[in-house]
């Protein structure tokens, strides 16, 4: 008789999850040689230990502490790029501007990017069938708690001028319910962070509106100002040109507004 299995509303663990995490860890130590000392086997064991045999709606930040410890990494605190709902462009940017870092450029973010995982209470099995959905099932699921934990730590580490890339094509350019809006904004340290600079990325070719005047951006400015951090905002009217100018800043066309 097959054992009864909890059906969740979200997709199950990404196939070949253990192999993927291990391979990514090894790859990361290769492309980031300063992390040569990281023991990828121990990293996987700590990752697994955070959710295996635990109820997938009952995960805490504490569960991830052994993994956080092993993944401790110093990134230049004044070179942090946060993003919300515009991951691909943020990653394209840091691939060109190699001295800036998104969360997914750190070891822990790189390991988990685009993956789903969960276990089952009291069994050592990984659930490849379904995992809890944040809205429909529960918020304290393995994936959500992981990203909340690493996002908080990343924001806490930031200093000087912190940049955030926001998607100007969305109805809520700044969304209080996003990871940026609910976690990172509230964990920037006013004693270390002087300014949050928002880059609002325009979607349409002919969109010349000043999206820095959007009500949700004003809401972000208000939240940040109340935390004694200065706020500034720039429109990026042409993201393609913006990336091109990051690659070739001497280009004569790069002096004009992008």
């Amino acid at each position: 008789v097959p054992r009864w299995r909890q059906q969740w509303s979200g997709p199950g663990t990404t196939k070949r999850f253990p192999e993927t995490v291990l391979a990514r860890c090894v790859k990361y130590t290769e492309i980031h040689p300063e992390m040569r000392h990281v023991d990828c086997q121990s990293v996987w064991d700590a990752f697994k230990g955070a959710f295996i045999s635990k109820h997938p709606c009952n995960i805490t930040e504490e569960d991830y502490q052994p993994l956080m410890k092993l993944g401790t990494q110093t990134v230049p605190c004044n070179k942090i790029l946060l993003w919300s709902r515009i991951k691909d462009l943020a990653h394209q940017f840091t691939q060109v501007q190699r001295d800036m870092f998104t969360l997914e450029d750190t070891l822990l973010g790189y390991l988990a990017d685009d993956l789903t995982w969960c276990g089952e209470f009291n069994t050592s099995k990984i659930n490849y069938q379904s995992c809890p959905d944040w809205r429909k099932d529960c918020s304290n699921n393995p994936v959500s708690v992981f990203w909340k934990t690493v996002s908080r730590r990343f924001a806490e580490a930031a200093c000087d001028v912190v940049h955030v890339m926001l998607n100007g094509s969305r109805s809520k350019i700044f969304d209080k319910n996003s990871t940026f809006g609910s976690v990172e904004v509230h964990n920037l340290q006013p004693e270390k962070v002087q300014t949050l600079e928002a880059w609002v990325i325009h979607g349409g070719r002919e969109d010349s509106r000043d999206l820095c005047q959007d009500p949700t951006i004003k809401e972000l400015e208000s939240i940040i100002s109340k935390r004694n951090i200065q706020f500034s905002c720039k429109n990026i009217y042409r993201p393609d040109k913006f990336l091109q100018c990051v690659k070739n800043p001497e280009d004569s066309s790069c002096t004009s507004e992008i």
């Epitope: 291990l22 391979a23 860890c25 090894v26 790859k27 130590t29 290769e30 040689p33 300063e34 040569r36 000392h37 990281v38 023991d39 990828c40 086997q41 110093t74």
Partner: antibody
Framework: QVQLVQSGAEVKKPGASVKVSCKAS????????VEWIRQRPGQGLEWMGV????????NYAQKFQGRVTMTVDRSSTTAYMELSRLRSDDTAVYYC???????WGQGTLVTVSS | DIQMTQSPSSLSASVGDRVTITCRAS??????VAWYQQKPGKSPKQLIY???NRYTGVPSRFSGSGSGTDFTLTISSLQPEDLATYYC?????????FGQGTKLEIK
């Protein structure tokens, strides 16, 4: 326990090639990068390059580029370092080492002499 | 390539002495520095990683410090078995590079 056991000493003529092996045991072979370092007689340590046993991708020091080839055989958990067009100043002890916790092989003496 | 300049190239000290070896990188390497001990006729043994972290089993008399370009290995109380050559290595960027070594002799 983790062990890296290297092949025995070799004597080669100038212009020849040498292939040194490094048999890994006691850990998951594809989970750690393997690097190669050499030490000429009475000299310091010189880093040659690194290989990812999982993907086979390599990164060589410029000095050895074009002469060194690092490979792995995953079925036997063995890493190899081949150095071609040998010269007398390639006479050295060649070491393999594993990323994380700094495990090293015992070294292989390669003597290049006519 | 990043140059690692180690000093002194040799030193002689007595049992119980505090010994300091320094290493200077030609450019900023953050904390991506390791220290190795090589005893005569043996493979090198890694003592320190990330500039200041001791590997398991390494005696507490060995400590590392520094970041950026200047790094130090300290032996707080020299023991007879510490007779060896010590090397620093940067692993911030490929190719990894070693200092030229410090030969430590016991008086």
């Amino acid at each position: 326990q983790v062990q890296l056991v290297q092949s025995g000493a070799e004597v080669k003529k100038p212009g020849a090639s040498v292939k040194v092996s490094c048999k890994a045991s006691g850990y998951a072979f594809t989970t750690y990068l393997v690097e190669w370092i050499r030490q000429r007689p009475g000299q310091g340590l010189e880093w040659m390059g690194v290989i990812n046993p999982g993907s086979g991708s390599t990164n060589y020091a410029q000095k050895f580029q074009g002469r060194v080839t690092m490979t792995v055989d995953r079925s036997s958990t063995t890493a190899y370092m081949e150095l071609s067009r040998l010269r007398s100043d390639d006479t050295a002890v060649y070491y393999c080492a594993r990323y994380a916790y700094g495990y090293w092989g015992q070294g292989t003496l390669v003597t290049v002499s006519s | 390539d990043i140059q690692m300049t180690q000093s002194p190239s040799s030193l002689s000290a007595s049992v119980g002495d505090r010994v300091t070896i320094t290493c200077r990188a030609s450019q900023n390497v953050g904390t991506a520095v390791a220290w190795y001990q090589q005893k005569p006729g043996k493979s090198p043994k890694q003592l320190i990683y990330s500039a200041s972290n001791r590997y398991t089993g390494v005696p507490s008399r060995f400590s590392g410090s520094g970041s950026g370009t200047d790094f130090t290995l300290t032996i707080s109380s020299l023991q007879p078995e510490d007779l060896a050559t010590y090397y620093c290595q940067q692993y911030s960027t490929y190719p990894f590079t070693f200092g030229q070594g410090t030969k430590l002799e016991i008086k």
